[in-house]
């Protein structure tokens, strides 16, 4: 009997007192469990278990399938076991053909022997094919054959357990190894769109694609800073052996403003985790926001080109865009395009190309845009800078010399006197009167300035210059004086 300290509960005694026993097929299996607190016998082989409450286990006609571990347990939970092999020349292997192996782990080919005294218990490839060179295995008659450190390359490998019985090689039924890949990288996650803009009541639907080596990857949609379980639907595909794809679709059938926020698609496996986010913005109604890309007050020189450019955000999509000048709509000379080709783009650009502007083409240019919810517009005030033009230069009946010039910005008129025939006039003459004639007229046209000087101040022959100038340029007109005795000759104006 097992030797234990007195008073201490001891495990039961099994008779025959062997760890392992061979019984011939057809013979009786008789096992006796001796223990004052006997509870039960348990039999285990592969996935099968049986129990017996009698202290003597009797199987009258042993079959190969009675091969297995017989355990006797007492009321203290202590147990003893004996492993019985039922030797059946016709059935050398007990087989559980399901064979799954986790990559880099060991896996058991479950083909326990019914006769432990056979030789060369090993694995063989099907149809005489050799096993992979790096495949290592450890045989155990009671359990089967353990394949060490399963490789991904062993997936779908066809195997037999093999043993030599009385000089002949015997093969078990075939096994097909299915390898469950190890996670050696985090899942790859992507989202259908990075951001969503919706009006209240519209449906929000977003799809997360999770890619990994197997379907045991975990994934979920989460709302940031919220524990609420989101409703999601799944579709999945196996693209080949170690290429699994899942699509997790999150839907809010009628979005509300307070649904706005960041939604995270989270995936993890035993290697690590990955996530991707999408932003939902729900607005109560649509909007348009216009941003001028140049100053809305534009100064341009006569004959030059200018582009009036706006960027605008429009949600929902813009339906009508137009550029207007003097109540006239441009049919050409402008273009409107989305800022990006991104599906979720709400930003657009509109450009009006004004070419070789004339002084008469200054004014207010307006961009109008609308969608199903709102209208918006922006105005550009365009000023065309023109070089002064001398409209009139006359000697008036009262003896005044008068010069009228037009231009933008408002021209300044200066007067100069040149003695004799000199063309270079340096001595300035102060005007008697200066007036801006159309200051109250339309705001964008040329400004007309009139300036007068008193010719009676000139006592010698010479030339008077009227010079009109602004930021753009200058123009001059001349008056010639000739004295005959005490009388002034006719004054001849010329430019």
């Amino acid at each position: 009997q097992p030797s234990v300290s007195p008073g201490e509960p001891s495990p039961p005694s099994i008779h025959p007192a062997k760890s392992e026993l061979i019984v011939r097929v057809g013979n009786e299996i008789r096992l006796l469990c001796i223990d004052p607190g006997f509870v039960k016998w348990t039999f285990e082989i592969l996935d099968e278990t049986n129990e017996n409450k009698q202290n003597e286990w009797i199987t009258e006609k042993a079959e190969a399938t009675n091969t297995g571990k017989y355990t006797c347990t007492n009321k203290h939970g202590l147990s003893s076991s004996i492993y019985v092999f039922v030797r059946d020349p016709a059935k050398l292997f007990l087989v559980d053909r399901s064979l799954y192996g986790k990559e880099d782990n060991d896996t058991l080919v479950r083909c326990p022997l019914t006769d432990p005294e056979v030789t060369s218990y090993s694995l063989k490839g099907c149809q005489g094919k050799p096993l992979p060179k790096d495949l290592r295995f450890v045989p155990d008659p009671k359990a089967g054959i353990t394949i060490k450190s399963v490789k991904r390359a062993y997936h779908r490998l066809c195997l037999h357990c093999s043993a030599d019985q009385e000089g002949k090689s015997v093969l078990s039924d075939k096994f097909i190894l299915k390898v469950r890949p190890a996670f050696k990288a985090v899942p790859v996650v992507s989202v259908s769109k990075a951001s969503y803009l919706l009006r209240e009541g519209e449906e929000f639907t977003v799809t997360c694609t999770i890619k990994d080596v197997s379907s045991s990857v975990y994934s979920t949609w989460k709302r940031e800073n919220s524990q609420t379980k989101l409703q999601e639907k799944y579709n999945s595909w196996h693209h080949g052996d170690f290429n699994y794809e899942r699509q997790a679709t999150l839907t809010i059938s009628s979005a509300r403003v307070n649904d706005s926020g960041v939604f995270m698609c989270y995936a993890n496996n035993t290697f690590g985790s990955a996530n991707v986010t999408t932003t939902l913005e729900v607005v109560d109604k649509g909007f348009i926001n216009i941003f001028p890309m140049i100053n809305t007050t534009v100064f341009v020189n006569d004959g030059e080109n200018v582009d009036l450019i706006v960027e605008y955000e429009a949600f929902p999509k813009p339906e009508h865009q137009q550029w207007i000048y003097m109540n006239r709509t441009f049919t050409d000379k402008w273009e409107d395009y989305p800022k990006s080709e991104n599906e979720s783009n709400i930003r657009y650009v509109s450009e009006l190309h004004l070419t070789r502007l004339k002084g008469t083409e200054g004014g207010t240019y307006t961009f109008l845009v609308s969608n199903s919810d709102v209208n918006a517009s922006i105005a550009f005030n365009v000023y065309v800078n023109t070089k002064p033009e001398i409209l009139t230069y006359d000697r008036l009946v009262n003896g005044m010399l008068q010069c009228v010039a037009a231009g933008f910005p408002e021209p300044t008129i200066d007067w100069y006197f040149c003695p004799g025939t000199e063309q270079r006039c340096s001595a300035s003459v102060l005007p008697v009167d200066v007036q801006t004639l159309n200051a109250s007229g339309p705001p964008f046209g040329k400004l007309v300035v009139q300036s007068s000087i008193d010719s009676s101040a000139f006592k010698h022959n010479g030339t008077v210059e009227c010079k009109a100038y602004n930021d753009v340029g200058k123009t001059s007109a001349y008056f010639n004086f000739a004295f005959k005795g005490n009388n002034k000759e006719q004054i001849h104006p010329h430019t």
Partner: antibody
């Protein structure tokens, strides 16, 4: 060669002690449960006791006639089996055989030649 | 303890005879029964184990049968080297008791 060789027998007075040894060779000693069987002069065979192997946790079992006086032990590193006999009685006089059990049954498939133990004053 | 009763305790037979020795157990021992042959001055030798399995190297004229409590050893054609003492032994429950032996002598 597969064999068992007993040693340590001899003449001993009643109440004395003796230690028998059994040297195993030619097989994997650690795999086997081992027994002692004795045979008094002109009598039949009597099982004395046994020791299990490591798989059987080296458990020992004894015949009622020797329990408490005899101790069986083994040293797997030396491929040796021992029988320590204390408080010897005249009725312990016998040829003592060392015997091997096969791995998967209880029988004695290999025997030593035996060693004679005589308990006499 | 399980008692093993062997009969006859001795028998005389001639070469070529069919010899039968019986062994009875005091309780059912299933097939846990072994047969040994012992010649004078020699160690016993295993002939049959598990009631009917012939030990490797043993001539096929030896056979065993029985299960439960009654067992038989048969020598189909006695040979000169078969004159010896034969023992049965139960290996179900310790102590592993032997029968008293059957001595097979030359007639």
């Amino acid at each position: 060669e597969v064999q068992l060789v007993e040693s340590g027998g001899g003449l001993v007075q009643p109440g004395g002690s003796l230690r028998l040894s059994c040297a195993a060779s030619g097989f994997t000693f650690v795999d086997h449960d081992m027994d002692w069987v004795r045979q008094a002069p002109g009598k039949g065979l009597e099982w004395v006791g046994r020791t299990r192997n490591k798989l059987g946790s080296y458990t020992t079992e004894y015949a009622a006639s020797v329990k408490g006086r005899f101790t069986i032990s083994r040293d797997d590193s030396k491929n040796s089996l021992y029988l320590q006999m204390n408080s010897l009685k005249t009725e312990d006089t016998a040829v003592y055989y060392c015997a091997r059990e096969p791995k998967y049954w209880i029988d004695f498939d290999l025997w030593g030649r035996g060693t004679l133990v005589t308990v006499s004053s | 303890d399980i008692q093993m009763t062997q009969s006859p305790s001795s028998l005389s037979a001639s070469v070529g005879d069919r010899v039968t020795i019986t062994c009875r157990a005091s309780q059912s021992i299933s097939s846990y029964l072994n047969w040994y042959q012992q010649k004078p001055g020699k160690a016993p030798k295993l002939l049959i184990y598990a009631a009917s399995s012939l030990q490797s190297g043993v001539p096929s004229r030896f056979s065993g049968s029985g299960s439960g409590t009654d067992f038989t050893l048969t020598i189909s054609s006695l040979q000169p080297e078969d004159f010896a003492t034969y023992y049965c032994q139960q290996s179900y429950i310790a102590p592993y008791t032997f029968g008293g032996g059957t001595k097979v002598e030359i007639k």
